[in-house]
Interface confidence: low
Amino acid sequence: YDFTNCDFEKIKAAYLSTISKDLITYMSGTKSTEFNNTVSCSNRPHCLTEIQSLTFNPTAGCASLAKEMFAMKTKAALAIWCPGYSETQINATQAMKKARKSKVTTNKCLEQVSQLQGLWRRFNRPLLKQQGSSDYKDDDDKHHHHHH
């Protein structure tokens, strides 16, 4: 899906009002320094691409995020504010229904949600720079802290 046509300000509002709080709730009890951010994004469409992937694509050790409150609200925000997004997600919805119903919060899931928090913060104010470039005066570290 091409996220360049989304209404970023509306999605940002949804994040600030509810999604961010749900992410914090999910991470409650986890030390803010426990996980390092390894997933990055440089523009808001790119951030949404990464957010969608981490939120809805099952990964090894963490298959249950799609049923979490923050995921459902993320899905709703994308469906409402990204034209044509819903149509592309029919197969993904079927896969989500087949996911196991029990909510098991594994360490892998906590790490994944920690990455999501970082991506959402970058979506909120994108870094606007490619990662790993040594030719420029960049210091990304301050953007990698967790705020819980």
Epitope: T4, N43, R44, Q130, Y136, D138
Partner: antibody
Framework: QVQLQQSGPQLVRPGASVKISCKAS????????MHWVKQRPGQGLEWIGM????????TLIQKFKDKATLTVDKSSSTAYMQLSSPTSEDSAVYYC??????????WGQGTTLTVSS | DIQMTQSPASLSASVGETVTITCRAS??????LAWYQQKQGKSPQLLVY???TLAEGVPSRFSGSVSGTQFSLKINSLQPEDFGSYYC?????????FGGGTKLEIK
């Protein structure tokens, strides 16, 4: 409405440092990055670098690392670019422009710098 | 660094004609490309961003498109106020780079 008001034209001697200002109004200054772009007479546009007004983090291309210094004054919502030891090669129009996703939706009116002895 | 090759460098056309300006990126920049118009002695003005999204207030005779690493700006039914210089710019990441520009003149 959003405005980026730049300082007026400047005539400087070679070697004398010069500072160009860009006063922002009509939006939250710290939400957008401020970029600087150079345009020599009759030439195209050249990206110099950018500054994040919220924490003054800067990114400059190699060519301008020893030439340009970018700063901001949050209290007055003003961005500055200082050019050190200017030569005739630095004679150009300099623009500030704001961005969130990398494209420039608002530009300053430009500051013409003339370096001449 | 990503290089942006813009063509043609100059173009003569008459009011009412349709013109297309192209820009090729040296590597994949997806849809991260903007187009600007600049009149003599004035600041550039944003026309298109994300390759095909029209900026606020830009007439619908302007349109952007993308095919791989080639980007196009099409101006239908040229108006007198459309003459000037046009620049493409990638906004995929640092360093931002611009195309060399296209000067659109009245025939």
């Amino acid at each position: 409405q959003v405005q980026l008001q730049q300082s007026g034209p400047q005539l400087v001697r070679p070697g004398a440092s010069v500072k160009i200002s860009c006063k922002a109004s009509g939006y939250s200054f710290t939400t957008y990055w401020m970029h600087w772009v150079k345009q020599r007479p009759g030439q195209g546009l050249e990206w110099i670098g950018m500054i994040d007004p919220s924490d003054s983090e800067t990114t400059l291309i190699q060519k301008f690392k020893d030439k340009a210094t970018l700063t901001v004054d949050k209290s007055s919502s003003t961005a500055y670019m200082q050019l050190s030891s200017p030569t005739s090669e630095d004679s150009a129009v300099y623009y500030c422009a704001r961005t969130l996703d990398g494209y420039y939706d608002y530009w300053g009116q430009g500051t013409t710098l003339t370096v001449s002895s | 660094d990503i290089q942006m090759t813009q063509s043609p460098a100059s173009l003569s056309a008459s009011v009412g004609e349709t013109v297309t300006i192209t820009c090729r990126a040296s590597e994949n920049i997806y849809s991260y490309l903007a187009w600007y118009q600049q009149k003599q002695g004035k600041s550039p003005q944003l026309l298109v961003y994300f390759a095909k999204t029209l900026a606020e207030g830009v007439p619908s005779r302007f349109s952007g498109s993308v095919s791989g690493t080639q980007f196009s700006l099409k101006i239908n039914s040229l108006q007198p106020e459309d003459f000037g210089s046009y620049y493409c710019q990638h906004h995929y990441g640092t360093p931002w780079t611009f195309g060399g520009g296209t000067k659109l003149e009245i025939k």
